[in-house]
């Protein structure tokens, strides 16, 4: 038995749950999710049982062995998979675990812009990036193109300090999971701060 | 790989026919059994894998048993309660893991009639 | 139901044609499946083992391919004594299954 094996899907996908027997008289493998038999396999009987009618299309033995491929990734096939091998030559079965994640691939990220101010000149607000249907495992970065040099910034919110007659710039937030990656659409700090050009001291959402 | 001889038998009859193995072992073989009606095709009976578990047609399930003597290199095939229908020529198999069945005997006639 | 569905029944190829069998699972079975030959009054011989590797002395005219749960065997370049019946053997929910055969005829 080795360790957990962590395997990372996309939705729609497939992912392949690698197994290396060594044993040599094989009795059955079977594969299990989150407790539920998944497929039993007796390979002298020569049976496939694939237990639930809705994974009969999903499921192969991609490499002529007993690896398990399972494919049209659903969210909820996020979980622990789990095979035993059993033989009459083994004292106890050979087992392998597995962690399954099944990633969204993203969306373009929504981008919201907090209180603005406009004092002496420089506008200053924050903006922030975020996924509409709170998709998990997000990962956030901000790019600033524009000035001398290109910046960027970790983390989902951006805060913005930019002066009036100084080159405009542009942000781009883009967000990350394990399986993708989509960027917003570019936001220009001129059109950003025209809303608080005509007062220098204004506030706004 | 050969069946022993067959022959006829006469309806509600038990059939007992043998596989004889020469130049591997029982313990790292499986043998299968297969049988073909007149005219007609191959038929899975059943088999006994390398480590003596055996597995069986849904239709043989009820009426078939296979044994093995490894001693004698033997595996046993039983089928109660013949009928016309189970007249055919049996054929016994070995079964060579992941290599598919490899090695197969001349086959034996059965004739149930009364 | 069937769940080795073998086809065609029959067909019949000229000398130096080719000929292509199929055998269609109903779920997937990996590569548990293999292809044989029969002639009159002869045993099954091996042909194709694992869906797609040639047995030990069988012609490379002989080939097995596999395409999600539907397996072919193709014979190029068909000979006079290829002419007989060939079968394919998979796994199934059941055990041991052979498809229903193929009868090959050379013109």
């Known amino acids: 038995s080795g360790p957990v094996k962590e395997l990372v899907g996309s939705v729609g996908g497939a992912v392949t749950f690698p197994l290396k027997s060594k044993v040599k008289q094989v009795d059955s493998i079977v594969w299990t999710f989150n407790t539920t038999p998944l497929v039993t396999i007796q390979p002298e009987g020569g049976t496939i049982i694939v237990t639930q009618n809705r994974n009969r299309e999903r499921v192969d033995f991609p490499d002529g062995g007993y690896s398990l491929k399972l494919s049209k990734l659903k969210k909820n096939d996020s979980g622990i998979y789990y095979v035993g091998i059993y033989s009459s030559s083994l004292q106890q079965p050979s087992t392998q675990e597995y962690v399954l994640h099944v990633y969204e691939h993203l969306s373009k990220p929504k981008v919201t812009m907090g209180l603005q101010s406009n004092k002496n000149g420089t506008c200053v607000t924050n903006l922030t990036c975020c996924m509409e249907h709170g998709e998990e495992d997000v990962i956030y970065t901000w790019k600033a193109l524009g000035q001398a040099a290109n910046e960027s910034h970790n983390g989902s919110i951006l805060p913005i300090s930019w002066r009036w007659g100084e080159s405009d710039m542009t942000f781009i937030c883009v967000a990350r999971n394990p399986v993708s990656r989509n960027f917003s659409s570019p936001i220009l700090a001129r059109k950003l701060c025209e809303g608080a050009a005509d007062d220098p001291d204004s506030s706004m959402v | 790989v050969k069946e022993s001889e067959g022959g006829l038998f006469k309806p509600t009859d038990t059939l007992t026919l043998t596989c004889t193995v020469s130049g591997f072992s029982l313990n790292s073989y499986g043998v299968i059994w297969v049988r073909q009606a007149p005219g007609n095709g191959l038929e899975y009976i059943g088999i006994?894998?390398?480590?003596?578990?055996?597995y069986y047609a849904s239709w043989a399930k009820s009426r078939s048993t296979i044994t093995r003597n490894t001693r004698l290199n033997t595996v046993t095939l039983k089928m109660t309660s013949l009928t016309a229908a189970d007249t055919a020529t049996y054929f016994c198999?070995?079964?060579?893991?992941?290599?598919?069945?490899?090695?197969w005997g001349p086959g034996t006639l059965v004739t149930v009639s009364s | 139901a069937q769940v080795l569905t073998q086809t065609p029944s029959s067909t019949s190829v000229a000398v130096g044609g080719t000929v292509t069998i199929k055998c269609q699972a109903s779920q997937s079975i990996g590569s548990w499946l293999s292809w044989y030959q029969q002639k009159p009054g002869q045993p099954p011989k091996l042909l194709i083992y694992g869906a797609s590797n040639l047995a030990s002395g069988v012609p490379s005219r002989f080939k097995g391919g596999r395409s999600g749960t539907e397996y072919s065997l193709t014979i190029s370049g068909v000979q006079r004594e290829d002419a007989a019946t060939y079968y394919c053997?998979?796994?199934?929910?059941?055990?041991?299954?052979f498809g229903a055969g193929t009868n090959v005829e050379i013109k």
């Open positions: 053997l998979g796994a199934s929910p059941n055990g041991w299954a």
């Open positions: 006994i894998g390398s480590s003596g578990n055996t």
């Open positions: 198999a070995r079964y060579y893991g992941d290599s598919g069945f490899d090695s």
